[in-house]
Structure formats: C-alpha cells, structure tokens
C-alpha cells in the first residue's frame, strides 16, 4: 500500500542532489587548495543529518551546525560582495575580480547554490515530488535555514568596506525581505565594518538616472546609519561594459563615448 | 578615503607641451586604477586616460591617441598626463579620478574625483 505523502507548494528536491553536493565538494576542494583538508563524505553526511527524517517545517539552524563547522572557512573579510536579486552579475563580477568572493564563492554556498532540498519526517528518504515553498508553506523549510544560516555567518565574517550589488531594474531597488535586507544588514558587525558600498546596477541601456537617490536607497542608507556604519551608494550605468573593463581595461570601448 | 590634487595646467601655444600631475593623499594610492577626463565649455566631461593600479596598461581616448602619455608613480602617490603637440580643441579643464575597479567612460560612477586644472590652447 503506498504510503500517504505530504504535497508541498514547492518544487521537490533537485534530481541527483546526494551526487550533485558530493560532486560539487570534490570540485570545489580540488581547485581551492586551502580547502584540501575537507572530506567530503563526512560533509554530504553533515548535510544530509541536517533534514533527513526531520519534519520540513520544522528546521532549525542548530540541524546545519555540524555542516557549519565542517564547512569553516576563511576569507578575506574586507573583499566581500553581497547581493541581492542580481545574482548572475555578482558572480560575473567575482569571477572577473578574482579576490573579492560571494557567498557561492565559499564551499558551502558553492555547495548549495541553485539546489532545492527537503527530506520527510521519519523516514530516511529525500523528498523528491514537493518540498515546502518558503510563502505558502513554511520558512523553517530545510533551504530556507540552510541559506539563512550561511548568510548570517558571511556577513558577521565582513570587515572594513562591504559591497553590495542590488538590481536597479527592480521595483524595490532594496528589499527588506530580501536575504540582504533581513539577515545580512542586520548581522554586519559595526565594530568590524566601516562602510557598506551599495552598487545600484541599472538595466536599461540609455537609464542615466541616479538611482542612488531611490526611497528603497534612502531607507537601506537609514538602517545602515543606525547601525553606526557608514553608507556609500554608486550607479552601475552600463554593467556589461564595466565588467569589460574591469577585465580588460585596455578594451577600446572603456575610453570611448559610445 | 582618497583626496586627488590636479596640478600643471596653464596657457600653452599650439603645439606646444604640458605636464599635469595628480597628487593622492591615502596609503591606499596602489590600489585605486586612475584616469584623467576634460570638459571643454558647454560641452560633456569626456574621458581622456587611463591608468591601471600598477601602471602596466593603459589605454586613450581617440583625439588623443600619440599625443599624451599617462603615467604613475605609486611611490609618490602621484599619476601624470604629459600632453604634446597640443592643440586648440584639447583646450578644457582637466580632472582625474580614482576607481578601485575600473576607470572608462560612461560605465559607472567613480569612487573620487580631483578638483580641475585649467588647460588653454592658442593659435
């Protein structure tokens, strides 16, 4: 007789997820040498002891503390970007500018990203049909505290100056909902960070507006202040040149009007 | 935080040279790539050079192309412009700015801009 299975308002976890995150640590300790230590074995059980048999709506991030620890990692916390609804360009960018690193530059955002996980409660088996959406379902759901965790530690990481890249094209340029504007903001620590550098990255081609002087803008700018960390705002006009010309600043179209 | 000082500008004859300097307070002047625009009355700042962080690339303007030179000493805190065979239409103000990125034209806003330099060319 098959056994009743809860539905969920979300996608199931992602087809081959045990051999994706395996493979992906492999990779991933392979090209980052200060990584080597890591056994990845002992990383997918860390994972996977953090939901497997445990209720979908009922994660906490204590359940991704052993995965935390295996996944320790240290990077230069002064060439940090965030970003928020502009992921794409982040990662162009950190791919460009090799010493600065998002999240997904870390082993476990590597890990993770794109991913969609959930497992059942007492059972050992992985979810793949539905897993819990964060909206109409629950936002303890296994990503959600996976994402909410490993943010919260990125930005308490962070010192000197952060950067942020933000999505001009968006009705909300700065989202308080966002994983930026609900986890990150608050867990940048004043002691340690001087000044967040938000970068608005505009989206139409001829749109010379300053959108630093947007009210999402000005309202990430007041929590920031309070926070007593200094805030600085740049418009990203043309973002697939500057990436050009970041990589490659002897490109004739870094010196040309066009 | 990095304060840019533009310097060297004057009155020159067609043809003639010039040497503008920007000076950079800031421990931090090697890691910044510089530049130097110009905007001429009534008209939009243009981009002029560009200079990266350590010097090894640079990259002109058109007009300006075999005429100027960009450079930088790093341990002088200081990026030049020598300008030569000048000529009425190079006439402007000169600014140079610093990006910890990238300096190009159009692309960004940049992280700091000096004050300007008065350039004049005669006939």
């Known amino acids: 007789v098959p056994r009743w299975r809860q539905q969920w308002s979300g996608p199931g976890t992602t087809k081959r997820f045990p051999e994706t995150v395996l493979a992906r640590c492999v990779k991933y300790t392979e090209i980052h040498p200060e990584m080597r230590h890591v056994d990845c074995q002992s990383v997918w059980d860390a994972f996977k002891g953090a939901f497997i048999s445990k209720h979908p709506c009922n994660i906490t991030e204590e359940d991704y503390q052993p995965l935390m620890k295996l996944g320790t990692q240290t990077v230069p916390c002064n060439k940090i970007l965030l970003w928020s609804r502009i992921k794409d360009l982040a990662h162009q960018f950190t791919q460009v500018q090799r010493d600065m690193f998002t999240l997904e530059d870390t082993l476990l955002g590597y890990l993770a990203d794109d991913l969609t996980w959930c497992g059942e409660f007492n059972t050992s088996k992985i979810n793949y049909q539905s897993c819990p959406d964060w909206r109409k379902d629950c936002s303890n759901n296994p990503v959600s505290v996976f994402w909410k965790t490993v943010s919260r530690r990125f930005a308490e990481a962070a010192c000197d100056v952060v950067h942020v890249m933000l999505n001009g094209s968006r009705s909300k340029i700065f989202d308080k909902n966002s994983t930026f504007g609900s986890v990150e903001v608050h867990n940048l620590q004043p002691e340690k960070v001087q000044t967040l550098e938000a970068w608005v990255i505009h989206g139409g081609r001829e749109d010379s507006r300053d959108l630093c002087q947007d009210p999402t803008i000005k309202e990430l700018e007041s929590i920031i202040s309070k926070r007593n960390i200094q805030f600085s705002c740049k418009n990203i006009y043309r973002p697939d040149k500057f990436l050009q010309c970041v990589k490659n600043p002897e490109d004739s179209s870094c010196t040309s009007e066009i | 935080d990095v304060q840019l000082q533009a310097s060297g500008g004057g009155l020159v004859q067609a043809g003639g040279s010039l040497r503008l300097s920007c000076a950079g307070s800031?421990?931090?002047?090697?890691?910044?790539?510089m530049g130097w625009f110009r905007q001429a009355p009534g008209k939009a700042r243009e981009i002029v050079a560009t200079?990266?962080?350590?010097?090894?690339?640079?990259n002109y303007a058109v007009p300006v192309k075999g005429r100027f030179t960009i450079s930088r000493d790093n341990a002088k805190n200081t990026v030049y412009l020598q300008m030569s065979s000048l000529k009425p239409e190079d006439t402007a103000v000169y600014y140079c700015?610093?990006?910890?990125?990238?300096?190009?034209?159009?692309?960004?806003?940049?992280?700091?801009w000096g004050q300007g330099t008065q350039v004049t060319v005669s006939s």
């Open positions: 800031g421990r931090s002047f090697s890691s910044y790539a």
């Open positions: 700015a610093a990006d910890r990125f990238a300096v190009a034209s159009g692309t960004h806003d940049l992280d700091y």
């Open positions: 200079i990266t962080r350590s010097g090894g690339s640079t």
